[in-house]
């Protein structure tokens, strides 16, 4: 079960539903972006491979005071089996490359859409 209860969903949902809703939230962010997202904050780039949900959360959790990505942070926590806190990093981070949050979101969205189309929901 993908359990996002208490975060963004009304309770446990299928993995495909959780991924669908995460994609829609990222679409929302990209569509509604007017000023630079999160004031142009920079985050560590990640390898979009297995374990990327935790890696993405580890990157984004270091952005504070940005309400636009708070829901995304909560949703990503539902995909990550362990607790993630600011300053925590995994081997999936490309530690020599920082990108703007807006670009990070776009890259993540493109990859998640590809996974969704290919039926890779877990």
């Amino acid at each position: 079960l993908t359990c996002l209860g208490g975060f963004a969903s009304p309770g446990p949902v299928p993995p495909s539903t959780a991924l669908r809703e995460l994609i829609e939230e990222l679409v929302n962010i990209t569509q509604n972006q007017k000023a630079p997202l999160c004031n142009g904050s920079m985050v560590w780039s990640i390898n979009l491979t297995a374990g990327m949900y935790c890696a993405a959360l580890e990157s984004l959790i270091n952005v504070s005071g940005c309400s636009a990505i708070e829901k995304t942070q909560r949703m990503l926590s539902g995909f990550c089996p362990h607790k993630v806190s600011a300053g925590q990093f995994s081997s999936l981070h490309v530690r020599d490359t920082k990108i703007e949050v807006a670009q990070f979101v776009k890259d993540l969205l493109l990859h998640l859409k590809k996974l969704f189309r290919e039926g890779q929901f877990n």
Epitope: P14, P15, S16, E21, E24, V27, Q31, F116, G119
Partner: antibody, heavy 118, light 107 residues
């Protein structure tokens, strides 16, 4: 109460494009997911795809190369286009709602019959 | 795609009978299964979701059970309005898929 009403030509010639519209009343297509499902005569249900409240789309890979789902938010309508149709596309076509965070279809239109024949 | 197989494809029963329809998924779908009722010339209607949760307004004679790959829809006491075709649907992964249907006819 949300209601769905499908409309479109009942007869389409082979190799042409099937075009259907679903009008949503009592709710907004800028929320939830709006789906197309079809049912060939005397057969089961086949999922075609959806358009989301953001305008994002998903198509069943078995039909992907021929399907386009779009929307007109000003008219609160979604549409289905299926190109290069054959007799195998003869079916009753339904639009159905799927609410956010769900995976089941809670509201359906009454369906519209499309026959592919020359 | 996940294949959904229903059995039987049709059955004959009398008013008051207890009717059981089964649905088998080709892979584990946890409890992400719904059931629909369809009458001739009409759209399907949602009966049950999450394998056993009754949709609003659905009579309590309908019940669902199961998890993983095997599921059951039970009508405890068949009523005249229950003669219809029933479909299961998996929500585990896209594309969503339906069973072939079970037609419940009057004996």
């Amino acid at each position: 109460e949300v209601q769905l009403q499908e409309s479109g030509p009942g007869l389409v010639k082979p190799s042409e494009t099937l075009s259907l519209t679903c009008t949503v009343s009592g709710g907004s297509i800028s929320s939830d997911y709006w789906n197309w499902i079809r049912q060939p005569p005397g057969k089961g249900l086949e999922y075609i795809g959806y358009i989301s409240y953001n305008g994002n789309t998903y198509y069943n890979p078995s039909l992907k190369s021929r399907v386009t789902i779009s929307r007109d938010t000003s008219k609160n309508q979604l549409s289905l286009k299926l190109s290069s149709v054959t007799a195998a596309d003869t079916a009753v076509y339904y639009c159905a709602r799927l609410a956010k965070w769900t995976w089941y279809f809670d509201i359906w239109g009454q369906g519209t019959t499309v026959t592919v024949s020359s | 795609d996940i294949q959904m197989t229903q059995s039987p494809s049709s059955l004959s029963a009398s008013v008051g009978d207890r009717v059981t329809i089964t649905c088998h998924a080709s892979q584990n779908i946890n409890v992400w299964l719904s059931w629909y009722q369809q009458k001739p010339g009409k759209a399907p209607k949602l009966l049950i979701y999450k394998a056993s949760d009754l949709h609003t307004g659905v009579p309590s004679r309908f019940s669902g059970s199961g998890s993983g790959t095997d599921f059951t829809l039970t009508i405890s006491s068949l009523q005249p309005e229950d003669f219809a075709t029933y479909y299961c649907q998996q929500g585990q992964s896209y594309p969503y898929t339906f069973g072939g249907g079970t037609k419940v006819e009057i004996k």
